[in-house]
Amino acid sequence: EVEKTACPSGKKAREIDESLIFYKKWELEACVDAALLATQMDRVNAIPFTYEQLDVLKHKLDELYPQGYPESVIQHLGYLFLKMSPEDIRKWNVTSLETLKALLEVNKGHEMSPQVATLIDRFVKGRGQLDKDTLDTLTAFYPGYLCSLSPEELSSVPPSSIWAVRPQDLDTCDPRQLDVLYPKARLAFQNMNGSEYFVKIQSFLGGAPTEDLKALSQQNVSMDLATFMKLRTDAVLPLTVAEVQKLLGPHVEGLKAEERHRPVRDWILRQRQDDLDTLGLGLQGGIPNGYLVLDLSMQEALS
């Protein structure tokens, strides 16, 4: 806390300018009017204030706006934003995408801090949903943003926003998140033709059900092994050898290298060895010839 002292004669700040960097902390406190600072916040970034001087400036704004800063000030905080705590940010009402961009810029290239996470949360809650422009902005700054949301939060993403999602934005998503995103993507891309549709839907397929995979197998899509390995095990298990062969096309040879990993391992265990042999890949572990396969899950469902 800076002691209250009178401003020395001739040092009262008429504007926020470079001369203030030579003021001591107590002089800044005594000689800079908080209202002047608020109206000239855009100048602060251009002035190389020290860490301690920034503490004083923040303190002055906190005193002027105890209920939270207005957006006109927030938009021009610049690197002073990095001084804010999540508690400070929770008092804000940020509605402009430009304000959000300006503050994210200050943290660019760095991990999402608690301050940034709080800011985004406030912004999205204020908008009511993750619209396309917001999602565009957030994934541009934080490619992993989408996968940091809970399935419940993802449910507020409108299908139209899915167009903003790039494959790398889904890299860290788990199956529960893809379960929510996949139906939205399917809806968003439904009017595209076969090959274009597959290019767009491919990164969301970790949430696809069996019937959609079966449909894709009829379209000569040539799914790569990396995508196949991310599919839901429960969606892959009911696929026949012929369907998997059609789904993967020339990439089917890659199954051999993955035969000990899920979902390939579990899928092999469900196939007749005869059928697996038709692939000519030497896949082992299928059901031997002459054995009867009982689908217990079907039996349970019927009883």
Epitope: T50, Y51, Y79, L82, V106, H110
Partner: nanobody, 118 residues
């Protein structure tokens, strides 16, 4: 990690000149500004000169016209050319840099002693 190493200090007669250097290493982020502070015997830290990333320079009134701050971006080195030195300029001079993207942090060197005396 970031290291700032000052050199060039020493004993000089009134009216003489010195050139201080500050070599910065371990910098993996854009620097907002470099500066020089000094601490005279028995006094507090005083900002002497500062140079922003864009090259804008600012000086304390007490050194205007006598001191010049400059930087070599290639070698990450900052200089303080001090002319017409007086006994008032005696003190420990500290190099300083500001980080303002992703994190607010100020880094300091260990200081170099400047003594102006006849």
């Amino acid at each position: 990690q970031v290291q700032l190493v000052e050199s060039g200090g020493g004993l000089v007669q009134p009216g003489g000149s010195l050139r201080l250097s500050c070599a910065a290493s371990g910098i993996t982020f854009p620097v907002n500004a470099y500066g020089w502070y000094r601490q005279a015997p028995g006094k507090g830290l005083e900002l002497v000169a500062i140079i922003s990333a864009g090259g804008t320079t600012n000086y304390a009134d007490s050194v205007k016209g006598r001191f010049a701050i400059s930087k070599d971006n290639v070698n990450n080195t900052v200089y303080l050319q001090m002319n017409s030195l007086t006994s008032e300029d005696t003190g420990v001079y500290y190099c300083y840099l500001q980080r303002r993207i992703g994190m607010l942090r100020d880094y300091w060197g260990q200081g170099t002693q400047v003594t102006v005396s006849s």
